[in-house]
């Protein structure tokens, strides 16, 4: 079944102004790529490359397309039914706990550790202790000996908004 988005599902800044609120019309909703008119009678297309809606909805306006930040590459453009997909540039990654920016991947592992995972757009390189095999979560490699690695370039997105 198709998901639907209503006014109540939106963050406060995305909701219509109070005077624009209206009850759903009997036929109800507009398709993805559209929003509903203020009188609830018509469906209005989102503007290609400017805004979008992903589900059947009774929104009074479409959602603004995301613009990729510097340090990000655009994997796919915004259409009327899907938001822009941005991905961290090669050699950088975005963590769940700091989704607002891409951070540089470490160039290598601290001494006594080996690399078991490459830098990807959504994760730093992964290091484990040679003996125990336990993961290292430290931010910066030890200054002394590092095992260098070249950044990976997988194609899947690190942030899929929309």
């Amino acid at each position: 079944e198709s998901a639907l988005i209503t006014q109540q599902d939106l963050a406060p800044q995305q909701r219509a102004a109070p005077q624009q609120k209206r009850s759903s019309p009997s036929e109800g909703l507009c398709p993805p790529g559209h929003h509903i008119s203020e009188d609830g009678r018509d469906c209005i297309s989102c503007k290609y490359g400017q805004d979008y809606s992903t589900h059947w909805n009774d929104l009074l306006f479409c959602l603004r397309c995301t613009r990729c930040d510097s340090g990000e590459v655009e994997l796919s453009p915004c259409t009327t039914t899907r938001n822009t997909v941005c991905q961290c540039e090669e050699g950088t990654f975005r963590e769940e706990d700091s989704p607002e920016m891409c951070r540089k991947c470490r160039t290598g592992c601290p001494r006594g550790m080996v690399k078991v995972g490459d830098c990807t757009p959504w994760s730093d390189i992964e290091c484990v202790h040679k003996e125990s095999g336990t993961k290292h979560s430290g931010e910066v490699p030890a200054v002394e000996e590092t095992v260098t690695s070249s950044p990976g370039t997988p194609a899947s997105p690190c942030s899929l908004s929309g």
Partner: antibody
Framework: QVQLVQSGAEVKKPGASVKVSCKAS????????LHWVRQAPGQGLEWMGW????????KYNEKFKDRVTITADKSTSTVYMELSSLRSEDTAVYYC????????????WGQGTLVTVSS | DIQMTQSPSFLSASVGDRVTITCKAS??????VAWYQQKPGKAPKLLIY???TRHTGVPSRFSGSGSGTDFTLTISSLQPEDVATYYC?????????FGGGTKLEIK
């Protein structure tokens, strides 16, 4: 391949009703919106309304709202358009057409059903 | 409702000619315009959507342009099989509406 196969031609008297069917195949029925568009002889095209099987959403052109009813039978992937209180100016070819859940253009069309209203 | 006014309503051109059909919307429809080709006794076929995007399998001699209220369908080099009636359609706001059509024939 995608096919929209419509029912055969109909001749009706003024005041009567007609029900035209459109059987869809070659794609997932619940993922696309199906529309009815009509074309009077030698005239342009006129959008009548849609039905979306994914959530049973229906929208009618206000011009036809009081006389048209669009329904569907999901078990047979068929959409129906019933037009009541027929008048001579309803004589037209009625098409079903499909569109993705996005911009409202029609990528596949049925072959059309000629409905003639005559006393 | 938005009116779509097509011109000319009839057009005669020679094979190889560059042919242009225009469509004017009664209000701004952004780039939400599609073009269809309809041959006698057949259903319309989608050629162009979003004013300039060619539908799958449509020959490259067909192109579309425009935004706001003025739109154009161009056939760069007319072929005998292009004899048909061409319709524009706005898909910006319901009810979606069509132009009156342009009947194209070969001289």
């Amino acid at each position: 391949q995608v096919q929209l196969v419509q029912s055969g031609a109909e001749v009706k008297k003024p005041g009567a009703s007609v029900k035209v069917s459109c059987k869809a195949s070659g794609y997932t029925f619940t993922e696309y919106i199906l529309h009815w568009v009509r074309q009077a002889p030698g005239q342009g095209l006129e959008w009548m309304g849609w039905f979306y099987p994914g959530n049973n959403n229906i929208k009618y052109n206000e011009k036809f709202k009081d006389r048209v009813t669009i329904t569907a039978d999901k078990s047979t992937s068929t959409v129906y358009m019933e037009l009541s209180s027929l008048r001579s100016e309803d004589t037209a070819v009625y098409y079903c057409a499909r569109h993705e859940q996005g911009p409202g253009y029609f990528d596949y069309w049925g072959q059309g059903t000629l409905v003639t209203v005559s006393s | 409702d938005i009116q779509m006014t097509q011109s000319p309503s009839f057009l005669s051109a020679s094979v190889g000619d560059r042919v242009t059909i225009t469509c004017k919307a009664s209000q701004d429809v952004n780039t939400a315009v599609a073009w269809y080709q309809q041959k006698p006794g057949k259903a319309p076929k989608l050629l162009i959507y979003w004013a300039s995007t060619r539908h799958t399998g449509v020959p490259s001699r067909f192109s579309g342009s425009g935004s706001g209220t003025d739109f154009t369908l161009t056939i760069s080099s007319l072929q005998p099989e292009d004899v048909a009636t061409y319709y524009c359609q706005q898909h910006y706001i319901t009810p979606w509406t069509f132009g009156g059509g342009t009947k194209l024939e070969i001289k």
